[in-house]
Interface confidence: low
């Protein structure tokens, strides 16, 4: 038989979710998955999740990395599982910062 698609809505991907916005969940469904890193009060804050509306993700995902924030986006089930966003270094270090993973 042909590999026909199921009847269910095909546009969502399952994404790893990590961070305060995830509550007790460790996954979410969205039209894009993301992995982000930002610096808040000297801490490296890592987050992962999903953009449930494509336009919302399109804006954020196209933002080039800055010294204070980076977002990487992808489309595919759990595609953000092994993605860790990186801040642009350009030889510049951030003294006194610590890795701090928000769960």
């Amino acid at each position: 038989m042909e590999d026909e698609k199921p009847k269910v809505n095909p546009k969502l991907y399952m994404c790893v979710c990590e961070g305060l916005s995830c509550g007790n969940e460790d996954h979410c469904e969205g039209q894009q998955c993301f992995s982000s890193l930002s610096i808040n009060d000297g801490f490296h804050v890592y987050q992962k999740g999903c953009f449930q509306v494509y336009e919302q993700g399109k804006m954020t995902c196209k933002t080039p990395p800055s010294p204070g924030q980076a977002v990487e986006c992808c489309q595919g089930d759990w595609c953000n599982r092994n993605i860790t966003a990186q801040l642009p270094t350009k030889g510049k270090s951030f003294p006194g910062t610590q890795n701090f993973h928000l769960e």
Partner: antibody
């Protein structure tokens, strides 16, 4: 994350209409099919039907004549109505969001039909 | 599409390998999910697309199969795995579930 909260009358008499509502929080209402599933005490799961944000519905053929699912996108809510209930409709009713699996569920509402 | 699940109940010891099977009445490709339901709780999605584990679900749970024959395995049964397990297809409408398999610990 997507959270579903449901409510409605828990005790009905035969021939009455079952009415339940489910509110959706923290989710893209247009991204999911919104479903109702029921489970008679001690028994398995039965899919009742679904609706999307446009109001397009699909029902279980075994219940088509009695079941209506509606949506209120302004409130991010969807509702179930089941007419002419009998004791056989006694069950826990769940609202749930479906894409490729029922990943998010309401807490369940026990509906008892008894004279 | 009818989903036939077996056995309807089983009893096993902690650490045992437990396998549940689900058979579809027609080819459903890999559009099959497995759920765990504990008493008084809503079902929880464990595996989707026949073999993909939902993150956060312990790796002792696994699923295999395609077409009409599917299986679900707990590689080493733990006390917290006591529950009823259901398969469900989403190939077509109506969406249907298997009859469930209740897993108990052998004393």
């Amino acid at each position: 994350q997507v959270q579903l909260q449901q409510w409605g009358a828990g005790l009905l008499k035969p021939s009455e209409t079952l009415s339940l509502t489910c509110a959706v929080y923290n989710g893209s209402f247009s991204s999911y099919y919104w479903n109702w599933i029921r489970q008679p005490p001690g028994k398995g799961l039965e899919w009742l039907g679904e609706i999307n944000h446009r109001g397009s519905t699909n029902y279980n053929p075994s219940l088509t004549s009695r079941v209506t699912i509606s949506v209120d996108t302004s409130k991010n809510q969807f509702s179930l109505k089941l007419t002419s209930v009998t004791a056989a409709d006694t069950a826990i009713y769940y609202c749930t969001a479906h894409t490729r699996g029922f990943l998010y569920w309401g807490q369940g509402t026990l509906v008892t039909v008894s004279s | 599409i009818q989903m036939t699940q077996s056995p309807s109940s089983l009893s096993a010891s902690v650490g045992d390998r437990v396998t549940i099977t689900c058979q579809a009445s027609q080819d459903i490709n890999n559009y099959l999910n497995w759920y765990q339901q504990k008493p008084g709780k809503a079902p929880k999605l464990l595996i989707y697309d026949a073999s993909n584990l939902v993150p956060g679900v312990p790796s002792r749970f696994s699923g295999t199969g395609s077409g009409t024959d599917f299986s679900f395995t707990i590689s080493s049964l733990q006390p917290e795995d006591i529950a009823t397990y259901y398969c469900q297809h989403y190939y077509d409408l109506p969406l249907t579930f298997g009859g469930g398999t209740t897993v108990a610990i052998r004393r």
